[in-house]
């Protein structure tokens, strides 16, 4: 059986986009399918479609095709953002140049070379002819557009509206003439989609017929759109994998632009004394490799033959025998003059980052414009323009697009904790970047700390030394178990999320942990009916310096009479001094015959300055901390309580205002406790809950 050709490479893909018809007269056809490839094959062959298919949308969620007789350039149509949609437009209908003789040209040029308007194909005035649309199905003899239905030498043509001139060719340029590149085309982002021998390019997001490593999601900055020629690996010029199973790849015929200047955005930062990034812009005169062996001249083929010549690699400054990085290697290098050592790296050239100190941001980093593009977990950031829908989901204003260039760490949502980025990794959809606040920067990230401007309450409801047993509504209290023993407290803030402390996790093996909910006794005695035991599927540590951890449960807790969630305060809110609060916990109680029951200790909120005085001035509290003192001498949180909540009530609503963390001693008389201030991290908590995927119940 003849293998059906895969035609998806004939389409331009616009991810997360659909077309909406404003004109109700426009037709549309839909059908359930499995893949976008199936949609493409049917669109190309027009099989079973009552119109000429110019574009289609693949609905990934419903596994459905929507075929259109129009595209994004048609009138009566508008583009719309849609997470589950991918728009594919037949390139022939949007191309403004021709390939070869232009047989496949389906653009909208309708004027001849000398400027005469074309005669419509369906008309016999002023010229009678046999080129009827019905006789040339698939040749798109629409309107009065220039076409070459028989593939004749001169390229697309038309009958003219001038009775004196029967037909004339149209002046449509060859795509290879329109497309041009600078240097070796590393920054080329044009639409050439066939090789110099005319082979059609394979889509970068496909692995057939050739498997390859250049996945668009892995290299977001390389411009791997559709099946266009690119130069991701420092070759002499752009290339692509081909659809010919016997030709893995081939160069593309893209001429050098007449005005051979590079855009500012394409030029690597030129340095002469040190290496910035991978050193593509190094233009210094170091000419030995790291161990002192001299470099071979780039224009010489002795002792090593090579194609890294100044002619092949224009704009790479391959002068003399200086260390350079023309091919995107790890750092500048050269061929060596030692016949036994072909190449060597010049790693003795210092890194610019080391000589100019570290990247840092001021305030909350909303104006950070550095070029770091990886997260604190080492993930490469994904391009901002691919994540705009997700961004819109958690901000209510239009982000400043001019700042969201490439995939650099930025802070478009006014996050209090600094620059971040999306990753493209489903386990870690976004994360902070490893950039700290500039030393000495005192710009507050929350204003009005000491003025109760923002109320903390939104809606409704600690190992505690000398605390009294409690059984009232504490269904949000979690016992975090480590290797089957209670190690810490925690608060259930959402069915799948527990708020706790960094110090509670001695191991990174999630199988070591369990969350017990609905219990009153630390050993679960007598709680069998109400106890829920849940595994842990992920830990998300808080922003730099926070001591908080959000613990994702492997399945959602079932909310009932014994298990409930507790509310979070409003971001940046302040709670009035002397507000009565409580800490809860199963930790060390000061009693020899500890009964293992959950205890509560009553505290009251104390202002940061007063709190510092109680700590004899040895402690300065910042905006991320909250202080509460005991009504009863020597009661308060201790070991085993860490991670548990400081719960306060405002307007008859109970909420978790603090998290117990180690550091200030156990329930010391006249020493108020210092807790992590949850209000300072409320936006971070909401952002994680909103964006990190959780299992469905």
């Amino acid at each position: 059986q003849r293998k059906r050709r895969n035609t998806i490479h004939e389409f331009k893909k616009s991810a997360k986009t659909t077309l909406i018809k404003i004109d109700p007269a426009l037709k549309i056809k839909t059908k359930k399918v499995n893949t976008a490839d199936q949609c493409a094959n049917r669109c190309t062959r027009n099989k079973g479609l009552p119109f000429t298919c110019k574009a289609f949308v693949f609905d990934k969620a419903r596994k459905q095709c929507l075929w259109f007789p129009f595209n994004s350039m048609s009138s009566g149509v508008k583009k719309e953002f849609g997470h589950e949609f991918d728009l594919y437009e037949n390139k022939d209908y949007i191309r403004n140049c021709i390939i070869g003789k232009g047989r496949s040209y389906k653009g909208t040029v309708s004027i001849t070379k000398s400027g005469i308007k074309c005669q419509p194909w369906s008309s016999m005035i002023p010229h009678e002819h046999s080129f009827l649309p019905s006789s040339y199905r698939g040749k798109d003899l629409q309107e009065n557009y220039c076409r070459n239905p028989r593939g004749e030498e001169g390229g697309p043509w038309c009958f003219t509206s001038n009775p004196e001139v029967r037909y004339e060719v149209c002046d449509i340029p060859q795509c290879s003439e329109v497309e041009c590149m600078t240097c070796n085309g590393e920054s080329y982002r044009g639409l050439m989609d066939h090789t110099e021998s005319g082979k059609i390019c394979q889509r970068w997001d496909h692995q057939t017929p050739h498997r390859h490593k250049f996945l668009p999601e892995r290299y977001p900055d390389k411009g791997f759109d559709d099946n266009y020629c690119r130069n991701p690996d420092g070759q002499p010029r752009p290339w692509c994998y081909t659809l010919d199973p016997h030709t893995r790849w081939e160069y593309c015929a893209i001429k050098t632009c007449a005005d051979n200047t590079m855009n500012d955005t394409d030029v690597p930062l030129e340095t002469t004394e040190c290496i910035q990034g991978q050193g593509e812009g190094y233009r210094g005169t170091v000419n030995t490799i790291w161990n002192g062996i001299p470099c071979q001249r780039w224009d010489s083929q002795y002792p090593h033959e090579h194609d890294m010549t100044p002619e092949n690699f224009k704009c790479k400054d391959l002068r003399e025998n200086y260390c350079r990085n023309p091919d995107g290697s790890e750092s500048p290098w050269c061929f060596t003059t030692d016949p036994n050592i072909r190449v060597g790296y010049c790693s003795q050239i210092p890194n610019c980052d080391m000589s100019h100190g570290q990247d840092c941001y001021r305030g909350n980093g909303k104006n950070y414009m550095g070029n770091l593009s990886q997260t604190r977990s080492g993930l490469t950031c994904s391009m901002w323009d691919k994540n705009m829908e997700d961004l819109h989901r958690h901000i209510f204003w239009e982000p400043d697009a001019s700042k969201l260039n490439e995939n650099y760490c930025r802070n478009p949502d006014d996050d209090a904790h600094g620059p971040w980025c999306y990753t493209g990794n489903p386990l870690i959809p976004w994360d902070y970047c490893p950039i700290s606040r500039c030393e000495g920067d005192t710009t507050p990230t929350i204003v009005n700390l000491d003025h109760p401007v923002i109320s903390c309450a939104k809606t409704k409801q600690l190992r505690v030394v000398n605390g009294i047993p409690t059984r009232t509504n504490i269904g949000w209290m979690v016992s975090l178990r480590y290797r089957n023993k209670h190690i810490c407290g925690g608060s259930l803030i959402k069915e799948s999320w527990v708020l706790t402390a960094r110090q509670c996790f001695p191991s990174r093996d999630l199988k070591d942990y369990e969350a017990w909910l609905g219990i009153h006794d630390v050993h679960g005695r007598g709680d069998e009916k109400c106890k829920q035991v849940l595994n842990v599927s992920q830990l998300v540590y808080g922003p730099e310096g926070s001591d908080l951890v959000l613990m994702k449960l492997a399945r959602p807790a079932v909310l009932d009479d014994f298990v409930s969630t507790i509310d979070l305060p409003n971001y940046g809110c302040t709670i009035p001094e002397k507000t009565s609060c409580s800490v809860y916990g199963w930790g060390y109680t000061g009693l020899i015959n500890y009964d293992g029951l959950l205890r509560v200790a009553h505290l009251y909120i104390m202002g940061n300055e007063k709190c510092s005085q109680h700590h004899r001035g040895k402690v300065t509290l910042n905006e991320s901390e909250i202080c509460a003192g005991a009504e009863k001498i020597g009661s308060g949180p201790c070991e085993g309580d860490y991670g548990g909540p400081l719960v306060c009530e405002q307007h008859k609503m109970r909420m978790v205002l603090g998290v117990i963390v180690p550091g200030r001693g156990c329930a010391i008389p006249n020493r108020p406790g210092i807790f992590v201030r949850v209000a300072y991290y409320a936006k971070w908590i909401h952002k994680i809950i909103l964006t990190y995927k959780v299992p469905q119940s």
């Epitope: 892995r218 993930l379 994360d431």
Partner: antibody, heavy 118, light 108 residues
Framework: VEESGGRLVTPGTPLTLTCTVS????????MSWVRQAPGEGLEWIGA??????TYYTNWAKGRFTISKTSSTTVDLKITSPTTEDTATYFC????????????????WGQGTLVTVSS | QVLTQTPPSVSAVVGGTVTINCQSS???????LSWYQQKPGQTPKPLIY???SLASGVPSRFKGSGSGTQFTLTISDLECDDAASYYC??????????FGGGTEVVVK
């Protein structure tokens, strides 16, 4: 975590070491290579992160190449070994997608010895 | 990024206390400084992560403290089994790690 491929090589002969993990998936774990010359301290060479992005310390750029070759293996290539590269090479986990924002080396292999001598 | 560990070697008696310092030439991101113990012929074992958090199975005699560029490991109630080399490691912007030069602890 288990390293392999260490052996005696002559200067200039490229050598590839392999780190094989079991019970963890390299698509959610970032692995680092650390070396220790005889009687000396630990030196971080570089890493292959959760998504396969590679990072190197300054002195290692160009001299070493790290690549994630599958969901269970990550390689370290010593491009042109010199006698100074004689050391035990360790593979260790630095990052884990299950625990976001806690970077340290908690799982270590036993190491593989590389001797460079003419 | 340079981590300087001092002293290179220290000796103390059983039951005593040892303090090892680790100073960074640049600020360590988020205080992600960790401490490791290595005995001859063995693989390094994590003791402390994030400057002060105790790793799995590590007795509370080991205490980490510090922030920014200055960090300390304190071992109290010293035992014979604590004789080993100790290394600090820091994490920097740009996803770069660095180890300190090591401190040899001798227990008498």
């Amino acid at each position: 975590v288990e390293e392999s491929g260490g052996r005696l090589v002559t200067p200039g002969t490229p050598l590839t070491l392999t780190c094989t993990v079991s019970g963890i998936d390299l698509n959610s774990n970032g692995m680092s290579w650390v070396r220790q010359a005889p009687g000396e301290g630990l030196e971080w060479i570089g890493a292959s992160s959760i998504d396969g992005t590679t990072y190197y310390t300054n002195w290692a750029k160009g001299r070493f190449t790290i690549s994630k070759t599958s969901s269970t293996t990550v390689d370290l290539k010593i491009t042109s070994p010199t006698t100074e590269d004689t050391a035990t090479y360790f593979c260790t986990r630095g990052e884990y997608a299950g625990v976001v924002g806690s970077n340290y080396f908690d799982l270590w292999g036993q190491g593989t010895l590389v001797t460079v001598s003419s | 990024q340079v981590l300087t560990q001092t002293p290179p070697s220290v000796s103390a008696v059983v039951g005593g206390t040892v303090t090892i310092n680790c100073q960074s030439s640049q600020r360590i991101y988020s205080n992600w400084l960790s401490w490791y113990q290595q005995k001859p012929g063995q693989t390094p074992k994590p003791l402390i992560y994030a400057a002060s958090s105790l790793a799995s199975g590590v007795p509370s005699r080991f205490k980490g403290s510090g922030s920014g560029t200055q960090f300390t490991l304190t071992i109290s109630d010293l035992e014979c089994d604590d004789a080993a080399s100790y290394y600090c490691a820091g994490y920097y912007s740009g996803h770069i790690y660095s180890f300190g030069g090591g401190t040899e602890v001798v227990v008498k």
